[in-house]
């Protein structure tokens, strides 16, 4: 079975077939009696109820919402209600490229070492049984290989094969034909040797703060593509429902090894959260690097020196 | 989303073997990085094997030689073989995967399955 949509903000291609699937599924077969809504919101509108008749390109089955196809106009915010359950998404749903066949924004990025070993594998798990035919098309241009039902590329890299990969799943729907693209930006690289990653900026920040407001600790660090950066606090993480690590934000440097950061935003700040260590960890098989930061109180900023504070 | 289960855990006794096994929900061909960590109570979380989609592998110096990662796409499962394993090997570990999704890394986390080796 497909996994449900755990992910708060989507972007989408116009005109492709697209599903929100919410996370509490096993769940809504146990009580099939109970009233199960989806809602959407967006600028003006608040929370309008939706159901087939709402759109004709708009499908509901059991755990998910399906658009044939997403189009412009259903950027927004969705949910989905059962009983005391409620799920949230923003979709953001974006122009595609009418001059390519795929749209920029939407292309998932790989590097591939020379001589190693490279794979394309064209799938859509959700879609599969609806699915006529797949082609695959490097830099637009349509490859021929045997399987037109998941076509594959599997060799030792070479620099030629660097380019754009671009899977089109072609489906037919109430007699309407759909496809979905999922483009890969392949770049070939040469045998690159790891780095020791390394977390940027002291390794202990006393951080002033008032209670009530909210703050953000970044953590940013140079490492290699198999490296981690994750937040330590608190009993295994869990305690606390004011504490939210965000997303993580990746910029490969030119020596093609990668900047990242990762925000942990503490809302609402209470005394619990003052005067404990947040650790911010980078981990290689090499070993790890750690950075902490302490929330100490403004009007207690005057008992510590001035340089050991991060604004 | 990619939810990990991870399974394979127990105890054995030292010299013996294990194969840990990481389930993901969906194609691991999108994945860019994938990770085996460990936990022994009141120790440091150690990353013990990577292994990329670009086809590099790493280990952490105290398991080379003796732990083996590796995947199978048609299953969607990462491995982690352990031979010749050592009561210093008793931790809980972990699966963990990065991806690129919208154009954000996105990291998940599997819950975890006890290894314990003991005589």
């Known amino acids: 079975a497909e996994s449900c949509t755990s992910r708060p903000h989507i972007t989408v291609v116009e005109g492709e077939p697209f599903y929100l699937k919410h996370c509490s599924c096993s769940l809504a077969h146990e009580i099939e009696t109970t009233t199960k809504s989806w809602y959407k919101s967006s600028g003006s509108q608040e929370h309008v109820e939706l159901n087939p008749r709402s759109s004709s390109r708009i499908a509901l089955h059991d755990c998910v919402l399906e658009f044939w196809p997403v189009e412009l106009n259903d950027t927004g915010s969705y949910f989905f209600q059962m009983k005391n359950y409620t799920q949230k998404w923003k979709l953001n749903v974006i122009r595609r490229n009418k001059h390519s066949c795929f749209t920029e924004r939407q292309v998932t990025s790989k590097i591939v070492e020379v001589k190693k070993f490279f794979q394309i594998t064209c799938e859509n798990s959700y879609y599969q049984t609806l699915v006529n035919s797949t082609s695959l098309y490097k830099n637009c241009k349509k490859l021929l290989l045997e399987n037109n039902k998941n076509p594959t590329i599997k060799k030792n890299a070479e620099f030629e094969d660097q380019g754009y990969y671009s899977c089109v799943h072609f489906l037919h729907h109430n007699g309407k034909l759909f496809n979905i693209t999922k483009t890969f930006n392949i770049t070939i690289v040469e045998d690159r040797s790891n780095i020791v990653p390394v977390l940027l900026g002291p390794k202990l920040n006393h951080v002033a703060v008032e209670l009530g407001k909210n703050v953000r600790l970044n953590c940013s660090a140079l490492l290699n593509e198999e490296d981690v950066i994750y937040w330590m606090f608190g009993e295994e993480n869990g305690s606390d429902p004011n504490i939210h690590e965000e997303k993580e934000m990746r910029i490969m440097t030119p020596e093609g090894k990668w900047h990242a950061s990762k925000v942990l935003r503490i809302e609402n700040i209470g005394e619990s959260n003052l005067n404990v260590l947040y650790n911010c960890t980078v981990a290689s098989t090499g070993g790890t690097d750690t950075k902490s930061f302490i929330l100490v109180r403004k009007a207690d900023m005057a008992d510590i020196p001035g340089h050991v504070f991060t604004r | 989303d990619v939810p990990l289960q991870e399974s394979g855990g127990g105890s054995v006794q030292p010299g013996g073997s294990l194969r840990l096994s990481c389930a993901a929900s969906?194609?691991?061909?999108?994945?860019?990085?994938m990770r085996w960590h460990r936990q022994a109570p009141g120790k440091q979380r150690e990353l013990v094997a990577t292994?990329?989609?670009?086809?590099?592998?790493n280990y952490a110096d105290s398991v080379k030689g003796r732990f083996t990662i590796s995947t199978d796409n048609a299953k969607n499962t990462i491995y982690l073989q352990m031979n010749s394993l050592n009561p210093e090997d008793t931790a809980v570990y972990r699966c963990?995967?990065?991806?690129?999704?919208?154009?954000?890394?996105?990291?998940?986390w599997g819950q975890g399955t006890q290894v314990t080796v003991s005589s």
């Open positions: 963990n995967v990065g991806l690129w999704e919208d154009g954000l890394w996105y990291d998940y």
């Open positions: 969906k194609s691991i061909f999108s994945i860019n990085a």
């Open positions: 292994f990329t989609s670009s086809g590099r592998i």
